[in-house]
């Protein structure tokens, strides 16, 4: 019915019987309800359940209750269901953002870069080029830069310097290594997880796309390609690096240097001789899914001041 | 017993202004709203718009505003229908309501050269 | 604007039938609907609200059905007084409007 709706007191609204042009103060119904019948002068109001689909999220005062939103279009999830006290609420899955109204990959940070600022399911990643002293070898959405180990501190010598996509190769001082095999021709060079935080990936790290939950899903990882030496200035049409490649890097000297190397991991590196072949396979690296915030997808725009 | 007494008939000129008047009784003027309703022979029934004498507070049909003013006197507990810029248009009995159930008795407008 | 379709226009009758009259809302008003009657040359009554509640004062021939968007006034018993115009107005939303009116007449 038309009302004027003037602000009350707290658990009662303003209600115009129609027939007799009388304005009386009703009690509000509870959340989850809707008033199917006014008071009058000689009745309370009458409250009713939310039907199937609609909600009320306040004690209220209005006829019939909100309709919920649509069901999460893909490849949303809801976050909240349809119910008589709350309203559907979408949003987008692990490794997505919301991007006009749908949901697009988290950026990849390709390698050299790190993730600058975390991505939610409302922003995307922002990633940034590794400074001086750090690096980041994998392509990832999650991976900050980390620093390289410090083989000095190590009591390790530097056998190969890092670079922005790579780590420092540490190596034992022959000389003075009490470590050192008698099997000539083998050094054993370290390669310390370094202390410095970092996220700990949740799931494994696939190219081609996301672990979405949406099999249909076409979004694909896009991998943040730098165009200069700036932060986020970096397109993404490009494809990304493959999540598994090899990576043998040989010494100075012949043989070769088997490094495993995961952000994860504590891994040893050994100088084998060169009879012995390596076929270091980079280990898995993962995508974190992001913490979920609440966002209000396709929120109600209407304003009952007889719900509030 | 509730009463709304109106004006009796008026006769205006085209341009001129009228102003009818709703004298109510028999209840608290300041917690009802009262409306005003137009019926031309012929035309039917139009509802003008509706006043709450409580804090003066007014609504309009679209196509009566700009033409049609309501006031209210909580003194004399009477409410006011003012015409402006008339014509012939405008020739019709008016009503006052209490709600729909209760009704004043009307006013016949008559505009004419 | 809700449009209020009422029928018939006009009708004859005789003392002691029984009538009815309808009236649909362009769109559903529940139940927010009256009916008011109108004698020659003189104002209106209200004779039912809610679509179904009587109006003190009025006789239990009249009754009033319906809800969402189709209603109805029934008249049984028709007396000589009961011969008037009769109009529906739905007040579930502003502008409220009223249907077109049924003239009731002695045949």
């Known amino acids: 019915q038309p009302e004027q709706k003037t602000l009350s007191l707290t658990g009662t609204y303003r209600h115009v019987d129609r027939t007799t042009g009388q304005v009386l103060t009703c009690d509000k119904c509870p959340a989850g309800t809707y008033v199917s019948e006014h008071c009058t002068n000689t009745s309370l109001r009458v409250c009713s359940s939310c039907p199937s689909g609609t909600f009320t999220r306040h004690e209220n005062g209005i006829e019939r209750c909100h309709d919920c939103s649509q069901p999460c279009p893909r490849p949303m999830i809801e976050r909240l269901p349809c119910a008589a006290l709350t309203d559907r609420e979408c949003i987008c899955p692990p490794g997505m953002y919301q991007s006009n109204g749908t949901c697009a990959p988290h950026t990849v940070c390709p390698v050299g870069w790190g993730v600058r600022k975390k991505g939610t399911e409302n922003e995307d990643v922002r990633c940034k080029q590794c400074a001086r002293g750090t690096f980041s070898d994998v392509p990832s959405s999650v991976m900050k830069c980390r620093a390289h180990t410090d083989c000095l501190g190590q009591n390790l010598m530097v056998v190969k310097q890092g670079t922005k996509e790579t780590d420092n190769v540490c190596g034992v001082h022959l000389s003075s290594s009490s470590t050192t095999p008698s099997s000539p021709g083998i050094a054993t060079f370290s390669h310390p997880e370094h202390t410095e935080s970092h996220d700990v990936p949740s799931s494994t790290y696939e190219p081609q796309g996301m672990n979405s939950t949406d099999s249909n899903s076409t979004a694909s990882v896009r991998t943040k390609v730098p165009s200069d030496i700036q932060e986020e200035t970096v397109p993404d049409n490009t494809s990304s690096t493959s999540g598994k490649e090899s990576t043998n890097r040989t010494l100075p000297n012949p043989p070769q240097l088997t490094h495993q190397q995961g952000p994860h991991h504590r891994h040893i590196l050994k100088l084998l001789p060169s009879s012995m072949e390596a076929t270091g396979e980079k280990s898995s690296t993962a995508i974190k899914a992001p913490k979920r915030g609440h966002p209000r997808q396709n929120p109600h725009k209407h304003f009952d001041i007889n719900e509030h | 017993q509730v009463q709304l007494q109106q004006s009796g008939p008026e006769v205006a000129r085209p341009g001129a202004s009228v102003k009818l008047s709703c004298k109510a009784s028999?209840?608290?003027?300041?917690?009802?709203?009262l409306n005003w309703v137009k019926q031309r022979t012929g035309q039917g029934l139009e509802w003008i718009g509706e006043?709450?004498?409580?804090?003066?507070?007014?609504y309009y049909n679209e196509k009566f505003k700009g033409k049609a003013t309501l006031t209210a006197d909580n003194s004399s507990s009477t409410a006011y229908l003012q015409f402006s810029s008339l014509t012939s248009e405008d020739s019709a009995v008016y009503f006052c309501t209490r709600g729909v159930i209760k009704w004043g008795q009307g006013t016949l407008v008559t505009v004419s050269v | 604007d809700i449009l209020m379709t009422q029928s018939p226009s006009s009708m004859s009758v005789s003392l002691g039938d029984t009538v009815s009259i309808t009236c649909h809302a362009s769109q559903g008003i529940r139940n927010s609907i009256g009916w008011l009657q109108q004698k020659p040359g003189k104002s209106f009554k209200g004779l039912i609200y809610h679509a179904t509640t009587l109006e003190d004062g009025v006789p239990s021939r009249f009754t009033g059905s319906g809800s969402g968007a189709d209603f109805s006034l029934t008249i049984s018993s028709l007396e000589s007084e009961d011969f008037a115009d009769y109009y529906c107005?739905?007040?579930?939303?502003?502008?409220?409007?009223f249907g077109g009116g049924t003239k009731l007449e002695i045949k």
């Open positions: 107005v739905q007040y579930a939303q502003f502008p409220y409007t």
């Open positions: 006043i709450y004498p409580g804090n003066n507070h007014t």
């Open positions: 028999g209840y608290t003027f300041t917690d009802y709203y």
